[in-house]
C-alpha cells in the first residue's frame, strides 16, 4: 500500500500486469482478469444504504499515484489498496473501512431557558 505522504510518480513497469477484477472489469478483460501498465487495486466503500461493497481491478499508470494514495474524502467511507509485486496480487489485498467518525448532530449553539 502507498503511504499517504508519498508524492513520487510511479515508475512504469517494463511489462504488463494482470489483475483480478470484480465489479470493475473493462471491456478488454477476459475471465475477470484485466491488464494494466499501472497497479492492481482492491477497494472497499459504503454504498447508499451503508453496506460495504468490495471492488477490484486495474488502474492505469496515468493518475494511479493519486488514486492509490487513499486520501480521505469527507462524508465518504472508503479505503483502497494497490499493488504491483505480482500478477493478480490484489487477490491478497483486504482493505477495511475507516472507523465511523463521531458526528455532532446539533445544528447550532444550545440555548438554555
Amino acid at each position: 500500500k502507498k503511504e499517504d505522504g508519498e508524492s513520487t510518480a510511479p515508475t512504469p513497469r517494463p511489462k504488463v500486469l494482470r489483475c483480478k477484477c470484480h465489479h470493475h472489469c473493462p471491456e478488454d478483460s477476459v475471465n475477470n482478469i484485466c491488464s494494466t501498465d499501472g497497479y492492481c487495486f482492491t477497494m472497499i466503500e459504503e454504498d447508499d444504504s451503508g453496506l460495504p461493497v468490495v471492488t477490484s481491478g486495474c488502474l492505469g499508470l496515468e493518475g494511479s499515484d493519486f488514486q492509490c494514495r487513499d486520501t480521505p474524502i469527507p462524508h465518504q467511507r472508503r479505503s483502497i489498496e494497490c499493488c504491483t509485486e505480482r500478477n493478480e496480487c490484489n487477490k491478497d489485498l483486504h482493505p477495511t473501512l475507516p472507523p465511523l467518525k463521531n458526528r455532532d448532530f446539533v445544528d447550532g449553539p444550545i440555548h438554555h431557558r
Partner: antibody, heavy 116, light 112 residues
Framework: QVQLQQPGAEVVKPGASVKLSCKAS????????MQWVKQRPGQGLEWIGE????????MYNQKFKGKATLIVDTSSSTAYMQLSSLTSEDSAVYFC?????????WGQGTTLTVSS | DVVMTQTPLSLPVSLGDQASISCRSS???????????LHWYLQKPGQSPNLLIY???NRFSGVPDRFSGSGSGTDFTLKISRVEAEDLGVYFC?????????FGSGTKLEIK
Amino acid sequence: QVQLQQPGAEVVKPGASVKLSCKASGYTFTNYWMQWVKQRPGQGLEWIGEIDPSDRYTMYNQKFKGKATLIVDTSSSTAYMQLSSLTSEDSAVYFCARFGYYVDYWGQGTTLTVSS
Amino acid sequence: DVVMTQTPLSLPVSLGDQASISCRSSQSLVHSTGNTYLHWYLQKPGQSPNLLIYKVSNRFSGVPDRFSGSGSGTDFTLKISRVEAEDLGVYFCSQSTHVPFTFGSGTKLEIK
C-alpha cells in the same frame, strides 16, 4: 544484446510429446513475459500463450489449452513449451518472443515435424 | 477473438516507390489504459519477424525513418516512403490489447 536461442528442428512421432526450449540472454529474464507463437505455411501467426517468469503466471489462447504447457527455469533463463498428443496439425515453426507491452525480440524458431 | 484484416495480400512495387499497407481490426484496439497496442512486423524468408512499429506510430530502435505508422481505433496504416530492396518480405500487423493476441494474415511486398 537481447538473444533468444531456440533449437533449429525437432522430429517426433504422432501421439508423443515434445518440450521446446528458448534460452534468453542479454536482459533480465524476469522483467519480461515470454510468449510462444505458432506459424504454419499459409496459415499466418497464431498466439499460443505467455508466461511471466517472475511469478510463473500463465495466460493461454483457449485454442491451445490442453495442448501447450508453458514453464520457465529462472536459474538458467530458459523458457519451455511442452506440446502433448502430437498430430500432423502440430507440425509448424514455433517462435518464442519477449513481451513487455508488445513483442520486441523473437527467437529464430524451432521447426517441429510430426511424422511416423 | 479480434480479427485483423490486412490489405492488400500482395503489394508489387518498384524500388523507390511509396508503399502503403492497411490493417483493420474487428474491435477497437484502444485499451482501457488509453494505450493502443497495434504493432507492425516484417518477416523475411526463413527468418523470424522483426519489430518495426509499436503502439501505432513509434519506430523501434534501428528502424529507418522511411517507415511510419498511423491510425486509431480500428483502422491502421503502415507506410514506406521509398521502398528499398531490403524492405521486401511479409508485413504483419498485430494487436496486444485483447487476449488472445492476434495477427493479420500478412502482406507480401515484392518487386514489380
